[in-house]
Interface confidence: medium
């Protein structure tokens, strides 16, 4: 049975070539974490990070993706094409699977503050 | 090459054990998932266990669960499933297979081993 | 558990024709799903996985497409080899499991 809750940074904003930190955190469940995948809003994977293997940022993203902190992930030099949704998934043993939305709007004022308060879906 | 060669299969009796071995070579066992996969005679295909690079993780679907286990000794190269209490559907091929980095999809398989569970 | 309804169960088709096989998961399964292909007598062999993803060694006239909870395996221009049996299977949850399967056979 899933007992779990992924919790998200939820809606954050960010500025035009600013980074921002995409969190998911994983709670009320003992189960194990053995692969977090960070996926885009038209499905492609950003980033894998396996607890044996380690992390594997993907060709496309490498220049602009920073794994970390913790199983979060940090996006740089961000342009107005970023905006949209993006989704953690967390592959755990026993309980399978869990999924987490966060939804980035990058903003070209250079008054755009980023919020890191985590929301559950 | 990457080659994974499975052995152990045999004619068992319902509620008998049985032990798998699939011995590899070619790659580096040590850095893969790896999985047993079964194909019955109806032709399906039934996933049966998977294990983890360093073997700290096992998956099982209900059908086998507390019945069947996975390992693997990483000096030997070699992927190992335990097969206990056999039932008459567990009748079967059984592959042994690798994963892709970071993915569950299995893209080398054995070339399969034999088991019959019958009175 | 997931369900995968896999169809069409078997299809007769001649060389040169294009193809397409799919597979409707009971829910969603966000991408994590592969194609597999087994010849006659022989072990399967992986042609895509992640739903789009070509696997090395694939040849490029298999591709594979997404379009909510449906999965498709597409061939172009069949070729003889490419005769034989095809499965996809989901990773998603905790019990991986496979579609019925799809016959190719040569009309």
């Known amino acids: 049975m899933m007992t779990g809750t992924i919790e998200t940074t939820g809606n954050i904003s960010a500025k035009k070539g600013g980074s921002v930190i995409l969190q998911c955190h994983l709670s009320s469940t003992m189960a194990q974490v053995t692969q977090v995948n960070w996926e885009q809003h038209d499905h492609s994977l950003l980033a894998i990070r396996n607890a044996e293997l380690g992390w594997h940022i993907y060709p496309a993203f490498k220049d602009r993706v920073a794994p970390g902190p913790g199983l979060g992930l940090t996006l740089q030099s961000l342009t107005m094409n970023d905006t949209g949704e993006y989704f953690c998934t967390y592959h755990t043993y026993p309980d399978g699977t869990y999924r987490g939305r966060i939804f980035l709007e990058v903003l070209e004022s250079s008054v755009a503050e980023h919020s890191a308060r985590f929301q559950i879906p | 090459e990457v080659q994974l060669v499975e052995s152990g299969g045999d004619l068992v009796k319902p509620g008998g054990s049985l032990k798998l071995s699939c011995a590899a070579s070619g790659f580096t066992f040590s850095s893969y998932g790896m999985s047993w996969v079964r194909q019955t005679p109806d032709k399906r295909l039934e996933w049966v266990a998977i294990i983890s690079s360093g073997g700290n993780y096992t998956y099982y679907p209900d059908s086998v669960k507390g019945r069947f286990t996975i390992s693997r000794d990483n000096a030997k190269n070699t992927l190992y499933l335990q097969m206990s209490s056999l039932k008459s559907e567990d009748t079967a091929m059984y592959y042994c297979?690798?994963?892709?980095?970071?993915?569950?999809?299995?893209?080398?398989w054995g070339q399969g081993t034999s088991v019959t569970v019958s009175s | 558990d997931i369900q995968m309804t896999q169809s069409p169960a078997s299809l007769s088709v001649s060389v040169g024709e294009t193809v397409t096989i799919t597979c409707r998961a009971s829910e969603n399964i966000y991408s994590n799903l592969a194609w597999y292909q087994q010849k006659q007598g022989k072990s399967p062999q992986l042609l895509v996985y992640a739903a789009t993803n070509l696997a090395d060694g694939a040849p490029s006239r298999f591709s594979g497409s997404r379009s909510g909870t449906q999965y498709s395996l597409k061939i172009n221009s069949l070729q003889s080899e490419d005769f034989g049996s095809y499965y996809c299977q989901h990773f998603w949850g905790t019990a991986y499991t496979f579609g019925g399967g799809t016959k190719l056979e040569i009309k």
């Open positions: 297979a690798r994963q892709i980095h970071y993915f569950f999809a299995m893209d080398y």
